[in-house]
């Protein structure tokens, strides 16, 4: 099942087969250059549909520039199918499934004053299924609440803080939002989850949770990027993989990751027996786009230069602001994991036949479901954790 | 099956050193942490530090740093603990106790060394 | 570092009666351990993880709690549980023992 995996996944993070910019690595290691003793954790799917709803009413240059930063090649796949793939991706993730649990939505918060152009509402109602509210962004505090309250709603709970403030020259807000729940295939036993090591780096120890479980896994050992990589499948479709690098190695294997490479892991894994140890972790990642995506190409429209004619008629709406957050979790029933972009225009967003795999220094993770939900290198796990003993 | 065998008792002088060992068997002693543990008369545990031989990391508590010595020799699947400049504080039963992956840590224990310090 | 603090010191139980020891941590843990120990001998894990009875540990024990505070108890005492009882912290380093509780049997 795992070769059906490969075939389907899109792992741009976007429904188009052909790019010329790895969007998703590229945005990885700017994240990861700009602080690298950091976790990182992101949705590339949330960031990509947050970007492709934003093209939905860009115009000329800015439009191009946001398709381009997504690595997309109009001439080969046309705009209207990029969104319509977007619109059938969202109806795939929120079908409902046992033990899986992935709901994936837009909205769109608008000041009472601004008059929004018919026809970019209905295709964002139509293909990206998004809300749209009314909002007095006067009353900041009051518009701050109620884009807050709603997703939190809208993702449980797990992201309740995605604006911390808001700008009361702000007209429209274009939230996305991911929430993921998920069960292992086979849960960690508690009973083997014991206190462990984790070396932040060799001088650095902390304590963790560490899960346990034997089994047969997909594993592979890449000697190329001197890493191991391991996928843990969930109910449903998704697997995770984790990704340990050899002893001072991180930066090798963060180099390295590309489209092809997580193909090529997908499709090389094979069953092994090992002795996993996983910590049992939290980490988030929140990032402030508008800084991030000019060095991906994407800058006309966090500027005045920025065309957003198709959104409104006012002339003079740019982005000013993008924030994306996302939160995940790892525990022995599975991982949940949640992510949110805001857009505001200001757009805001032992044994001889086993091998003993330990996760006990930084390591990098990817949740796949046909597309790539979440990407992240855990450097030091968070520590919010009740859980059982050490090595 | 798993064993830690810990040297004898030792009698020594204040101010001299005492090198105490604590031999592995039934286990590869760089798969796992030796801990060691200090036991006062008629008093409670203390932990002293533990060794990591697959990453060469040594952590004492803070109390013991500079005066007590953890090493380990992989050949011999032995680790050692030294005790210098010895006073009667020091005067002690000093257990080996095995760190675990696949069975919990502090499962299996050392009979004990007692050190005692007397002029 | 983390202190433990075991309560009570010395205690003294009759055949039968319900037995429980606390320990208190002075700041949050993830799990608590507790240790068997009778004169002469080496420690012995009885309790790991907060609430798993190691291999041997006769059912009446049992181990509970979260955060800061956790604790041991013997549904039914039995003249073979005399013996002094160390809860011991592994969140972070230093690890910790509590000072000791003395199991008597009445």
């Known amino acids: 099942e795992m070769k059906k995996r490969v075939e389907d996944l899109h792992v741009g993070a976007t429904v188009a087969p052909s790019s010329r910019r790895d969007f998703t690595f590229d945005l990885y290691r700017v994240l990861a250059s700009a602080a690298p003793s950091q976790n990182i954790f992101f949705s590339p799917v949330s960031i990509s549909m947050s970007l492709a709803m934003l093209s939905l009413g860009a115009g000329s240059s800015t439009k191009m520039q946001i398709l381009e930063g997504l690595g997309l090649n109009l001439q080969k796949s046309s705009e209207e199918e990029l969104h319509r793939g977007f619109q059938q991706l969202l109806q795939e993730l929120n079908q409902p499934r046992d033990g899986f649990q992935l709901s994936l939505g837009n909205a769109l918060f608008t000041d009472l004053v601004v008059d929004l152009q018919d026809t970019f509402v209905s295709a964002m109602k139509t293909l990206y299924l998004a809300d749209t509210f009314p909002t007095n962004f006067r009353d900041s505090a009051g518009a701050m609440k109620q884009i807050n309250d709603y997703v939190a709603k809208q993702t449980k709970g797990k992201i309740v803080d995605l604006l911390k403030n808001l700008d009361s020259n702000a007209v429209v807000i274009m939230v996305n939002y991911i929430f993921f729940k998920a069960k292992w295939e086979t849960s960690f036993n508690h009973k083997g989850t014991q206190e462990q090591d984790f070396y932040v780096t060799s001088e650095t120890v902390v304590r963790v949770p560490m899960m346990s479980r034997e089994d047969q896994y997909h594993y592979l050992l890449d000697r190329n990027l001197s890493c191991r990589v391991v996928g843990v499948p969930y109910q449903g479709n998704a697997t995770a993989l984790f990704i340990l690098p050899s002893e001072g190695k991180m930066q090798q294997v963060e180099n390295g990751l590309s489209e092809k490479t997580l193909r090529k892991w997908l499709k090389m894994f094979k069953k092994r027996q090992l002795e996993l140890y996983l910590p049992k972790f939290s980490i988030e990642g929140s990032y402030q786009l508008e800084k991030v995506l000019p060095s991906l190409g994407i800058s006309n429209v966090f500027t005045s230069h920025a065309d957003l004619s198709g959104i409104s008629n006012h002339s003079n709406i740019q982005v000013s602001e993008m924030v994306h957050k996302a939160v995940v979790e790892v525990d022995e029933s599975g991982t949940r994991a949640a992510a949110a972009t805001g857009t505001i225009f200001t757009f805001r967003s032992a044994r001889l036949n086993s091998q003993r795999l330990v996760f006990n220094r930084p390591f990098l993770m990817f949740i796949v479901d046909n597309n790539i939900l979440f990407l992240g290198k855990v450097n030091r796990p968070g520590s919010d954790y009740k859980d059982d003993d050490d090595k | 099956e798993v064993q830690l065998q810990q040297s004898g008792a030792e009698l020594v002088r204040p101010g001299a050193l005492v090198k105490l060992s604590c031999k592995a068997s039934g286990f590869n002693i760089k798969d796992y942490y030796i801990h060691w543990v200090k036991q006062r008369p008629e008093q409670g545990l203390e932990w002293i530090g533990r060794i990591d031989l697959e990453k060469g990391n040594i952590i004492y508590d803070p109390k013991f740093q500079g005066k007590d010595n953890i090493t380990a020799d992989t050949s011999s699947n032995t680790a050692y603990l030294q005790l210098s400049s010895l006073t009667s504080e020091d005067t002690a039963v000093y257990y080996c106790?095995?760190?675990?992956?696949?069975?919990?840590?502090?499962?299996?224990w050392g009979q004990g060394t007692l050190v005692t310090v007397s002029a | 570092q983390i202190v433990l603090t075991q309560s009570p010191a010395i205690m003294s139980a009759s055949p039968g009666e319900k037995v429980t020891i606390t320990c208190s941590a002075s700041?949050?843990?993830?799990?608590m351990h507790w240790f068997q120990q009778k004169p002469g001998t080496s420690p012995k894990l009885w309790i790991y993880s907060t609430s798993n009875l190691a291999s041997g540990v006769p059912a009446r024990f049992s181990g509970s709690g979260s955060g800061t505070s956790y604790s041991l108890t013997i549904s039914r005492m039995e003249a073979e549980d005399a013996a002094t009882y160390y809860c011991?912290?592994?969140?972070?380093?230093?690890?910790?023992f509590g000072s000791g509780t003395k199991l008597e049997i009445k």
């Open positions: 011991q912290q592994r969140s972070s380093y230093p690890f910790t």
């Open positions: 700041s949050s843990v993830s799990y």
């Open positions: 106790a095995r760190g675990g992956y696949d069975v919990p840590s502090f499962a299996y």
